[in-house]
Every structure is written in structure tokens, then in C-alpha cells.
């Protein structure tokens, strides 16, 4: 089943986000992701987890997942590299970079976005953007249209209560409010940004969705920055 | 290691006040509420309140309100707590302890001592 | 406020035993989240309070798998399968369910 969903959300204007991506997995939405140089996405570790023998490609310049467009064109994945420290079990270090088996075509609709390199952390209450083309709904329906929500940004010793997510947000985390409006398993791989910046990708470990006090868990692109480089060079 | 080390024992005169401190190690300070409880001798444990060391913000136990004041210094990752109009009713040993995992790190523990 | 009650007060033991403390809270202490935030602390004598466990079942790490915490609802238990000599102590369950937060009396586990 895909990993994730926008709970809240609204249809996102079409193609107004060139730098999403559809990680597919056999011909179907797996994850989220975000084209972060012209020949790498940037993607959720766990996301590939199940995909041992499948055929993973990447869906560019989409809005809708099954309808033609001009813009939309799937590549192949040349290498999938995900971070040297991520485990199944925990929710750290939760990041995939996916080389494309060639460069991607760029124009309105295809296009990197900039991503943090300040490893700083995103002051509270900040609204960011988080989209996907996960379940809109707890009855699971799945959206063929790309979906997003603006979350505040919330800090990380209130996300670390024990009626939140109890210590386990490290400094290369952070969290953004999730009352009714979040994202959820099926968004994992997909984008937070804000100021026009990607600041954060979905964390793909199980919680529940739309409740107040599980908050959405991303993972810092600034506290990776040397790991993202260092794949990408 | 994640450390809490707590101010020495104080002895203050009844009407008085005392501030003790709890001062954070080992981790980022600003990433983990600080909450405090008291122990009277040979009884239980009693929470107090807690502080959000990003905003500063408090919740007390409605018992403590008006009796013990919680401020933070980030600068130097330190939590404090200020009693006030002590009696002979607070005499106990005072713990700040980080939440987070649950209260898995405690400081050793400051005993205050009102006595004329 | 949530009242926690430990039985029994005291639990004298011969090292090896298996024993077994019982907490019941004054009323539910699943939170709104549907998790149920019931812990055991020991507090060793001269020493601050030590997590043992957490939502209810959960070793917090390096505690010895002898240590095991099972219930729900209102009603709950800590068990010992064998009493070391490092076990001794006051034994608190502990609710975070609901503010304020509270302990329970306390339960010293002593030699006979």
C-alpha cells in the first residue's frame, strides 16, 4: 500500500511545485520525494524498505497521477542510495537519494528546489507546506491530484513530551503541528518546506495521523547537508 | 551523558526564599521540557510544574501556585526554581528531572531545610 | 487530581523471589492520544528515582528483563520474576496521563 497521506489538505495548484516527485513502485505511488538536482530526488529511507524486487521509477512534472500532461515524464532509477545509519526500526536518518537514469528534462513544471544548508532550526510556529499524493481521509481514499496543507512549525521540547513523541526527536529532526491537518505514512518521502525552502522531508515510521498530539516528524536536510553533497558529487 | 546537576543544600529561615538551580548537560538544552518534584522526608513524590525552555512557558500543579516560580536560563542551560514564604512544610528534597523519554534523567536532588 | 494507590506498603523478600506490586489510579488514565502513560520509578535509598517502565509494558533500556509491567484501564502491575539484592528499594507507579501528574504512594521492597 503507499506510505502516506494529507489529512486536511486541499488539491495543491497544478504544477505550482515543479520539484515534486512520485516515487512509483511498480507502476503505482509509493512516496513522496523532491527533485533536488537535475539527475537526484530526494526521498524517505524506509520508502524502499518492501521494494526488494519491484521496479522503482520516479514521476516528475505530475499533478495528476493517471491523467497525460504535457509535463509529466517517469524515469528509471539508476542507483538508490539511502543514508548509511538508517535502520527499520527507528525513524532517524530516514533519507534516500535517487539517482535518475539521466538528467531530467527542466522547465515550468520540473524543477530542483533549493534545499537548507544553515543548520538551524526553523523557528516555531513558522507555516510550511508539506504535499503528497497520499489518503485524504481516515477511509482511506487515495487522491489521483497532488495534495497540500501549511503546518506550523512546533518546537522540538514540546514534541518531545512524553505525550507527544516522548525523546525520540534528535536535533536532525523536527515536527510540525498535526491537529486534523497533517501528513501521514503515505506523504513519506515528500517535501516540507518553507520560505520556499526545502527544510524538512516526511518521516515514513507509523504513527497516527490528524492527532494533535502525534506530531508530523521530518527529517532536517541542513543536519545531512555533508551526506546529501557527498552522494550527489 | 546526560546530566542534571543540582545547586547544594540550602537552610533558610521560615518567611524566607530560596532559588535552586538544575543546570543541563550532555544534550541540547532547549529540546526537552524540565520538570521538578518534591519529596518530603519518607514520603512520596509530588510534581510541581514544568517549564518549555524554548518559550519559557510554566504549568504548575495548583497545589505549588503561588509557592514555586520555574525560569530558565538558556545561555547557560540551566532551570530554576524559586520557593517563596517557605515554612516548615517545604522542608524536602527538591528534583528537576528532563521529560523526555519519560523521566528518564533526574538531577541528584537539593535539600531545603526551613528552620528558624 | 488522579489518586494513585500502591499495595501493598511494604513486601519483605528473600532474594530470588518473584513478587509482584499492584497500582490502581483513581480513574482511567488512557490519555486522549490512546496511549496510557503509567510508569515505574525505583528509587534506591540516598538516590534519585530510576525509570524502570513506561506506557505500561515498555522496559525503558538497560533495565533487566526480570522487570515486567502488564494492565490497563485503572488496574496495574510490576513484576519482579527473581529479587536481586540491586532491586531493593521504594517502588513508584507513576500516571502522565493526565495533569497534574502523580505518583503513587510508594511500595519498599525490603529483605525479610
Known amino acids: 500500500p503507499p506510505r502516506g497521506r494529507i489529512l486536511g489538505g486541499r488539491e495543491a495548484e497544478a504544477h505550482a511545485r515543479p520539484y515534486m516527485a512520485s516515487v512509483q513502485l511498480n507502476g503505482a505511488h509509493l512516496c513522496g520525494g523532491v527533485l533536488v538536482a537535475e539527475q537526484w530526488v530526494l526521498s524517505a529511507a524506509h520508502c524502499l524498505e518492501d521494494a526488494a524486487d519491484g521496479k522503482v521509477q520516479v514521476l516528475l512534472g505530475a499533478h495528476s497521477l493517471s491523467q497525460p500532461e504535457p509535463s509529466k515524464r517517469l524515469y528509471d532509477v539508476l542507483r538508490a542510495v539511502p543514508h548509511p545509519d538508517s535502520q527499520p526500526d527507528t525513524i532517524d536518518h530516514d533519507l534516500l537519494l535517487l539517482q535518475l537514469s539521466e538528467k531530467a528534462t527542466l522547465g515550468p513544471a520540473v524543477r530542483p528546489l533549493p534545499w537548507q544548508r544553515v543548520d538551524r532550526d526553523v523557528a516555531p510556529g513558522t507555516l510550511c507546506d508539506v504535499a503528497g499524493w497520499g489518503i485524504v481521509n481516515h477511509a482511506g481514499r487515495r487522491p489521483d491530484s497532488l495534495q497540500h496543507v501549511l503546518l506550523p512549525v512546533l518546537d522540538r521540547a514540546t514534541c518531545n513530551r512524553r505525550t507527544h513523541h516522548d525523546g525520540a526527536i534528535t536535533e536532525r529532526l523536527m515536527c510540525a503541528e498535526s491537529n486534523r491537518r497533517d501528513s501521514c505514512k503515505g506523504d513519506s518521502g515528500g517535501p516540507l518546506v518553507c520560505g520556499g525552502v526545502l527544510e524538512g522531508v516526511v518521516t515514513s515510521g507509523s504513527r497516527v495521523c490528524g492527532n494533535r498530539k502525534k506530531p508530523g516528524i521530518y527529517t532536517r536536510v541542513a543536519s545531512y547537508a555533508a551526506w546529501i553533497d557527498s552522494v550527489l558529487a | 551523558e546526560v546530566q542534571l546537576q543540582q545547586s547544594g543544600p540550602e537552610l533558610v529561615k521560615p518567611g524566607a526564599s530560596v532559588k535552586i538551580s538544575c543546570k543541563a548537560s550532555g544534550y541540547t538544552f532547549t529540546s526537552y521540557y524540565k520538570n521538578w518534584m518534591r519529596q518530603r522526608h519518607g514520603e512520596s513524590l509530588e510534581w510541581i510544574g514544568d517549564?518549555?525552555?524554548?518559550?519559557?512557558?510554566?504549568a504548575y500543579n495548583q497545589k505549588f501556585k503561588g509557592k514555586a516560580t520555574l525560569t530558565v536560563d538558556r545561555s547557560s542551560s540551566t532551570a530554576y526554581m524559586e520557593l517563596r514564604s517557605l515554612t516548615s512544610e517545604d522542608s524536602a528534597v527538591y528534583y528537576c528531572?528532563?521529560?523526555?523519554?519519560?523521566?528518564?534523567?533526574w538531577g541528584q536532588g537539593t535539600l531545603v531545610t526551613v528552620s528558624a | 487530581d488522579v489518586l494513585m494507590t500502591q499495595t501493598p506498603l511494604s513486601l519483605p523478600v528473600s532474594l530470588g523471589d518473584q513478587v509482584s506490586i499492584s497500582c490502581r489510579s483513581s480513574?482511567?488514565?488512557?490519555?486522549?492520544?490512546?496511549?496510557?502513560?503509567l510508569e515505574w520509578y525505583l528509587q534506591k535509598p540516598g538516590q534519585s528515582p530510576n525509570l524502570l517502565i513506561y506506557?505500561?509494558?515498555n522496559r525503558f533500556s538497560g533495565v533487566p528483563d526480570r522487570f515486567s509491567g502488564s494492565g490497563s484501564g485503572t488496574d496495574f502491575t510490576l513484576k519482579i520474576s527473581r529479587v536481586e539484592a540491586e532491586d531493593l528499594g521504594v517502588y513508584y507507579c507513576?500516571?502522565?496521563?493526565?495533569?497534574?501528574?502523580?505518583f503513587g504512594g510508594g511500595t519498599k521492597l525490603e529483605i525479610k
Open positions: 528531572a528532563r521529560e523526555g523519554p519519560s523521566f528518564a534523567y
Open positions: 480513574q482511567t488514565i488512557v490519555h486522549s492520544n490512546g496511549d496510557t502513560y
Open positions: 507513576f500516571q502522565g496521563s493526565h495533569v497534574p501528574p502523580t
Open positions: 517549564i518549555n525552555p524554548n518559550s519559557g512557558d510554566t
Open positions: 506506557k505500561v509494558s
